[in-house]
Interface confidence: low
């Protein structure tokens, strides 16, 4: 039978010779060389070689337990002469023995953690973990112990668990917010000769409400005119709070003072300022100075910090009311007036009124701001505010006149007010319709009677209430015996039609048609426009081919035979 135990081999052998593993031996071996030992399985012939005569096994390479801790091989012993096995093939194990060749490695290079400031000693912060690739079942090569290299006296670490805890009382974020802690993990249970690794833990103290708001000054003074309407901001006060975020939020309130019912304080949530505003109408003649006691407080307070004192501060606000001499006030914010464009000079359009709101009720005089009426189209009665024309108007030149009227206190010319006047000029039918463009057209020599050769359009500068209605006709002097007719389309357009079959450009190369365009408003306005018609040779599609090379634009007039 075979004679061996389990083989053990130390990893990371650095000797110059092959590393001896052990000996395969059969009790049938008489030492006369008649037996041959054969090795097969994991690494046989490569990592492990056997002396076939003696059964001695050697390792040819340096082995790493962390790569492969166990090798399973098979042993055979055969009779050299017969080739028959003298022992049954048997499996055996080579177990690689661990040495401490791996340092602990943390699961993270850098940890980040937060802990509230002012935490009790021993408050959990974060747990760090290091792993060691060595054999945890044998010796202490993988037994990791944690210690703190940097970060004392603020933090401590539990040697076995890697749990980091606070170690100092009353750590104050407002003094220091960031801490960098270095933790070491050492194997061999932390003993001499152990291997180690480190990690950095960045710890941020999070804010708690341990600081009250504080006014930077005990007294504030603001001025406001007596004319300030309710809601007017007078000034801003600001308390500062060393905390952050919600813990630094401040609410302001008025707690005392003779201005308690005259003023408000609004907390600006975004700027964390207290805005002092007017609550009721002020009157300089009744009271010139108010004092307020304003309090700034944290809306969210942690009871455990109440021993530090009240989470509020107060300041005195002195408000000086300023006297106001107010300018005249117009009866309207703006005036809209209208007048026909044919109004004669000195026609009254309307009037404005303004009054001095002061108790003195100073008399007021009116004037037109000439920067807004450079052409002096309008004037105003300085005493009663009546507006009248001083020049003729034309709606087609300017539809709206935007002028400014000034009311000035007679006894105090510095007190003045302005109001816009919007004067609309109403349309009167004072413009004749005319052609929308210069019309020059042509007629083919072979044209048939009643053929449309041109559509006419008209425009009118006026703007009648019911819209334009134009009528078109040939001028009386051309109506009889004309070679063309005008057909009014009743839609503000007209067509020129041929009146005969065929035209001869050698007899008459150009016709001038005087067309009368009238509107349908009162008083009726009309104008005469001339259409030039050239006689041309055309192809069978009616496309112009050639015309006499005469001037294209003719003076207004009538060719014979039009």
């Amino acid at each position: 039978s075979w004679m061996w135990n389990q083989f053990f081999l130390l990893e990371e052998y650095t000797g110059s010779d092959y590393q001896y593993v052990g000996k395969l031996h059969s009790d049938q071996d008489r030492g006369d060389g008649s037996l041959k030992y054969i090795l097969s399985g994991d690494g046989a012939g490569d990592l492990f070689i056997i002396n076939e005569n003696t059964g001695d096994i050697q390792a040819t390479k340096r082995l790493d337990r962390e790569e492969k801790p166990v090798y399973i091989l098979r042993a055979q012993a055969i009779n050299r002469r017969t080739g028959r096995p003298v022992e049954p093939e048997s499996e055996f194990i080579i177990k690689i023995h661990d040495i401490n060749d791996n340092e602990p490695i943390f699961t993270k290079e850098v940890y980040t953690a937060t802990v509230p400031e002012m935490s009790d000693v021993g408050t959990f912060v974060v747990q760090v973990t290091a792993t060691d690739a060595d054999d945890p079942t044998y010796g202490n090569s993988a037994k990791v112990v944690y210690s703190i290299l940097q970060g004392q006296p603020y933090f401590s670490v539990e040697s076995e668990t890697g749990i980091i805890k606070t170690a100092l009382l009353n750590m104050d974020r407002e003094n220091r917010e960031q801490y960098q802690v270095v933790i070491q993990a050492k194997d061999m249970g932390g003993q001499m000769g152990g291997l180690s690794g480190t990690t950095t833990v960045n710890i941020t103290l999070t804010d708690v409400n341990d600081n009250p708001p504080r006014f930077p000054q005990s007294t504030y003074q603001f001025k406001t005119p007596e004319s300030s309407p309710p809601g007017t901001p007078i000034g801003r006060i600001k308390a500062s709070d060393a905390d952050v975020g919600e813990n630094a939020e401040i609410e302001y309130s008025i707690t005392d003072g003779e201005g308690l019912d005259m003023f408000d304080v609004i907390t600006d949530q975004e700027t964390q300022e207290g805005i002092i505003t007017v609550k009721k109408l002020l009157d300089f003649e009744k009271k010139k100075v108010y004092t307020l006691k304003v309090e700034a407080s944290n809306p969210y307070v942690e009871p455990r910090f109440l021993y530090l004192g009240p989470f509020k501060d107060s300041a005195t606000v002195r408000i000086v009311v300023e006297d106001v001499d107010e300018p005249p006030v117009f009866s309207k914010l703006a005036y809209i007036l209208q007048i026909r464009e044919d109004a004669q000079i000195n026609t009254t359009i309307g009037s404005v009124t303004a009054q001095d709101p002061d108790a003195a009720r100073n008399p007021v005089k009116y004037s037109v701001d000439r920067h807004t009426d450079m052409d002096r189209i309008f004037n105003i009665d300085s005493g009663n505010g009546s507006i009248f024309t001083s020049k003729l108007l034309d709606r087609e030149t300017l539809l709206w006149h935007n002028i400014t009227v000034i009311a000035t206190e007679i006894n105090n010319p510095k007190q003045s007010s302005r109001v816009p006047l919007y004067i609309k000029v109403l349309d009167v039918n004072d413009n004749a319709p005319e052609f929308a463009e210069f019309y020059e057209t042509f007629v083919c020599e072979k044209a048939k009677a009643d053929q449309l050769i041109q559509t006419l359009h008209a425009v009118d500068k006026d703007d009648p209430y019911s819209g334009h209605q134009f009528s078109f006709s040939l001028a009386p002097e051309a109506a009889s015996g004309s070679n063309f007719t005008i057909q009014d389309n009743k839609d503000n357009t007209a067509g020129i039609l041929t009146r005969k079959n065929g035209y001869n450009r050698h007899e008459m190369s150009t016709y001038l048609l005087p067309v009368v365009i009238s509107d349908n408003d009162y008083p009726v306005q009309s104008s005469t426009g001339t259409v030039t018609v050239r006689v041309c040779a055309c192809d069978h599609h009616g496309n112009m081919q050639s015309c006499h090379a005469e001037a294209l634009i003719h003076p207004t007039g009538l060719s014979t035979g039009a």
């Epitope: 937060t114 941020t204 999070t206 804010d207 708001p213 801003r236 600001k238 308390a239 500062s240 709070d241 060393a242 905390d243 952050v244 975020g245 919600e246 630094a248 939020e249 401040i250 975004e270 700027t271 964390q272 300022e273």
Partner: antibody, heavy 121, light 107 residues
Framework: EVQLQESGPGLVKPSQSLSLTCSVT????????WGWIRKFPGNKMEWMGY???????SYNPSLKSRMSITRDASKNQFFLQLNSVTTDDTATYYC???????????????WGPGTMVTVSS | DVQMTQSPSYLAASPGESVSISCKAT??????LAWYQQKPGEAYKVLIY???TLQSGTPSRFSGSGSGTDFTLTIRSLEPEDFGLYSC?????????FGSGTKLEIK
């Protein structure tokens, strides 16, 4: 050390939306306030808005109707979306931190390097 | 909105000189003003807040003054690294607004 880095497309077509990301390292965006500012060609600068440590937002009234700022605290990133862009939105966009730990200090103590965005068809 | 007018828009100076940049607000903003510096290819950096308080890390040759509507940033004895773009910003009320910038270049 706090570091901010803007990222996003350098070219956006008119009428489309512009989306930018600000990645913050060295500081959690769940503390302090984090804003967007842009600088137009010619150096004119405009504050666009911010997102607070608690996720509350405030926008410049001139942009309020077409912008939004959001965040992903787990990634320590905050984002800008500007809708219906025109060529007038061509600018360098910056993200920055506002250290208002004493209430109302709306200046910016750490800035990103900026990212240039061109709006063009 | 509070408008911030910064002047000059361009300034050329030599190392060792002193320079001043002005920032004016259209209404009183108390001392809620910050000054920033931006060097080419770098991020903005806050130099001064609350009108005159130096941000940690800002060299003492920088100083801020003013209150209400008129503010000044002064740099005494310019160093080569001081050249760049300077901007002011009010944070008295929202929307927060910035000055148009001053480009400080080496003469």
């Amino acid at each position: 050390e706090v570091q901010l880095q803007e990222s996003g497309p350098g070219l956006v077509k008119p009428s489309q939306s512009l989306s930018l990301t600000c990645s913050v390292t060295g500081y959690s965006i769940t503390t302090y306030y984090w804003g967007w500012i842009r600088k137009f060609p010619g150096n004119k600068m405009e504050w666009m808005g911010y997102i607070s440590y608690s996720g509350r937002t405030s926008y410049n009234p001139s942009l309020k109707s077409r912008m939004s700022i959001t965040r992903d605290a787990s990634k320590n990133q905050f984002f800008l979306q500007l809708n219906s862009v025109t060529t007038d939105d061509t600018a360098t966009y910056y993200c920055a931190r506002s250290p208002i730990n004493h209430g109302g200090y709306w200046y910016f103590d750490f800035w990103g390097p900026g990212t240039m965005v061109t709006v063009s068809s | 909105d509070v408008q911030m007018t910064q002047s000059p828009s361009y300034l050329a100076a030599s190392p060792g000189e002193s320079v001043s940049i002005s920032c004016k607000a259209t209404k009183s903003i108390s001392n809620y003003l910050a000054w920033y510096q931006q060097k080419p290819g770098e991020a903005y950096k806050v130099l001064i807040y609350s009108g005159s308080t130096l941000q940690s890390g800002t060299p003492s040759r920088f100083s801020g003054s003013g209150s209400g509507t008129d503010f000044t940033l002064t740099i005494r004895s310019l160093e080569p690294e001081d050249f760049g773009l300077y901007s002011c910003q009010q944070y008295y009320e929202k929307p927060l607004t910035f000055g148009s910038g001053t480009k400080l270049e080496i003469k």
